[in-house]
Interface confidence: low
């Protein structure tokens, strides 16, 4: 689902075409409308929106599934430690939250995308904003990561103790609650509009194009390039650190924290390049025609499908780099499978038990 | 079969109003955007008037607008042309057509015409 | 308004012959419509989205261009091809119409 801007009135670029109380496909929005009719012509669009209603209700209910399965993984491995967790693990249990959040709207919009919005406006407006909340989490709460490895490596502070952890719940308090207000929009301007010619009903947003623009100007810096650039200044000082200083142990413990971080660029780095040319069209600085216009359209399903991808990914991240999470959810199976035999929860045989998987631990760089 | 039928026309003298009228039928009228069309004697083809599907909204030309208004009544299938304060220059054969629906979307063309009703502005 | 202008305005052709109509436009456009009209009928819908052939239009017909430059060609010309054709723009308010090209049989 990707959440644009459309009063679902106006077709494409053109404001005639506002004539018309128009469709428009869930994913190709046009302008509000307008008594200076036809300034521009509708695009045809037959080829995106039958690519999107084949291409996405698959992948949805694919990515639900797995999503599902790994985030609630992670989540139970996570929630299962008898010892407090690591600020790093914390960060990454919410992370698991958010994506958990997210691909549990999935399924809405896989319907919507196949065949209509049949949810009414409230799931709209709260499915939407869940939607949002948990795109831009996912992104700031990686962006928390990398910072607090970076003044724990670099600066060898240790902003989130393992003991109160007061800060590092008010680090997440304080990015939900910026998530919240980036949500706003939805709850104020998402509706399901009934198309009284097809008869047929969408969660669609219902503000102007300059709305429309500053919505996904806003997605782009702080649901992207601002996280991004806190987890490659962070990443480039950490591991300038840690080479200096030849700590292969180290380095080998930040493995699962910059993947997941080269995970996150690669997913969302082609949608968001999508959404900059559709920027620039809006804006007037490249040339909106009717082949550019449709390719947008398309290239903005496959790669948003890229994006939400990687709620799925960090699950299978930790699976195969983190050596801890792959121990503590074996434990985990065991002692779901074998209630009784508690000989079969033993400690793994790593010297530091407490440590954590996920993450350089503050005493040792054994973690994973 | 799509079937577009206009009537109303005749002479009016300048400065004269003319209701024009399009009976619909074959189709799903209220699905459709539909406008008028003018063909002058010199056979130039001039839009004049669109309006959506519900009636909610409406289209002109500078030429016209504030003299003509469209309107519809979807319970009768039929299509109106409003035209007041009118010149001789409005003298043309009147075509009400359809604007068709590609992928879900209006178009600004027009995939049936009816047979047109002619009005003389002279005095 | 973006003027269209359709050349020529006459054109005569025999039965068999290859014939383009010219339509240029005073600004670029996305799309070009075309419309057959004969004497005593409405127009018809004969090409849409610059090259897509209306149903019940012969394949000898073909659309092409872009920008400001579109032409309709009959790659073999048919006795009940001879009519008035018609370009319309929406690109850009108000909707315009060329002043029409009428084909005729030599």
């Known amino acids: 689902m990707v959440l644009e801007v459309s009063d679902h009135q106006v077709l494409n670029d053109a404001e005639v075409a506002a004539l018309l109380e128009n469709f428009s496909s869930s994913y190709d929005y046009g302008e509000n409308e307008s008594d200076s009719c036809c300034t521009s012509p509708p695009c045809p669009q037959d080829f995106s929106l039958n690519f999107d209603r084949a291409f996405l209700p698959a992948l949805y209910s694919l990515l639900f599934l797995l999503g599902l399965l790994g985030n609630g993984a992670v989540a139970a491995v996570l929630l299962s430690r008898r010892t407090a967790l690591s600020s790093t693990d914390t960060f990454l249990l919410h992370l698991a939250v958010a994506d958990t959040l997210l691909v549990l709207t999935l399924p809405l919009w896989a319907v919507d995308a196949a065949v209509q919005w049949v949810f009414g406006s409230g799931l709209c407006k709260v499915a939407g904003a869940l939607f949002n909340i948990n795109f831009y989490a996912g992104a700031l709460l990686l962006a928390c990561i990398s910072f607090d490895r970076y003044l724990n490596i670099v600066h060898a502070t240790q902003l989130y103790r393992r003991g109160p952890p007061a800060r590092v719940t008010l680090t997440c308090l304080a990015v939900w609650g910026l998530c919240l207000l980036f949500a706003l929009p939805d709850f104020i301007f998402l509706s399901a509009h009934h198309d009284e010619r097809l008869n047929a009903t969408h969660c669609q947003y219902n503000f102007p194009q300059v709305g429309r623009t500053a919505l996904r100007v806003l997605q782009l810096v702080a649901g992207f390039l601002l996280p991004l650039l806190v987890m490659a200044y962070c990443y480039a000082h950490i591991l300038a650190v840690l080479l200096v200083s030849r700590g292969q142990r180290r380095l080998r413990a930040m493995r699962l924290v910059v993947v997941v971080v080269v995970a996150f660029a690669l997913c969302w780095t082609p949608y968001h390049l999508v959404v900059l040319v559709d920027i620039l069209m809006d804006l007037g600085a490249l040339a909106r025609n009717c082949g550019r216009e449709s390719r947008v359209d398309v290239a903005k399903s496959v790669t948003s499908g890229l994006g939400y991808m990687h709620c799925c990914l960090n699950p299978l991240l930790y699976a195969f780099v983190g050596v801890k999470f792959r121990e503590r959810m074996w434990m985990l199976l065991l002692r779901l499978g074998c209630p009784n035999q508690r000989g079969l929860q033993r400690q793994p045989s790593s010297s530091r038990r407490d440590s954590s998987w996920s993450e350089t631990s503050e005493a040792s760089y054994s973690g994973l | 079969e799509v079937q577009l039928l206009e009537s109303g026309g005749g002479l009016v003298q300048p400065g004269g109003s003319l209701k024009l009228s399009c009976a619909a039928s074959?189709?799903?009228?209220?699905?459709?955007?539909m406008s008028w069309v003018r063909q002058t004697p010199g056979k130039r083809l001039e839009w004049v008037a669109t309006?959506?599907?519900?009636?909610?909204?409406?289209y002109y030309p500078d030429s016209v607008k504030g003299r003509f208004t469209i309107s519809r009544d979807n319970s009768k299938n039929t299509l109106y042309l409003q035209m007041s304060s009118l010149r001789s220059e409005d003298t043309a054969m009147y075509y009400c057509?359809?604007?068709?629906?590609?992928?879900?979307?209006?178009?600004?063309?027009?995939?049936?015409w009816g047979q047109g009703t002619t009005l003389t502005v002279s005095s | 308004d973006i003027q269209l202008t359709q050349s020529p305005a006459i054109l005569s052709a025999s039965v068999g012959d290859r014939v383009t109509i010219s339509c240029r436009a005073s600004?670029?456009?996305?799309?070009i419509y075309w419309y057959q009209q004969k004497p005593g009928q409405s127009p018809k819908l004969w090409i849409y989205f610059t090259s897509n052939l209306a149903p019940g239009v012969p394949a000898r017909f073909s659309g092409s261009g872009s920008g400001n430059s579109y032409s309709l060609t009959i790659s073999s010309m048919q006795g009940e091809d001879a009519a008035t054709y018609y370009c319309?723009?929406?690109?850009?308010?108000?909707?315009?119409f060329g002043g029409g090209t009428k084909l005729e049989i030599k």
């Open positions: 309006i959506s599907h519900g009636g909610t909204y409406t």
């Open positions: 600004s670029g456009v996305n799309y």
């Open positions: 074959g189709f799903t009228f209220t699905s459709y955007a």
């Open positions: 319309q723009q929406f690109t850009s308010s108000p909707y315009t």
């Open positions: 057509a359809r604007h068709p629906i590609y992928s879900g979307n209006y178009q600004g063309y027009f995939d049936y």
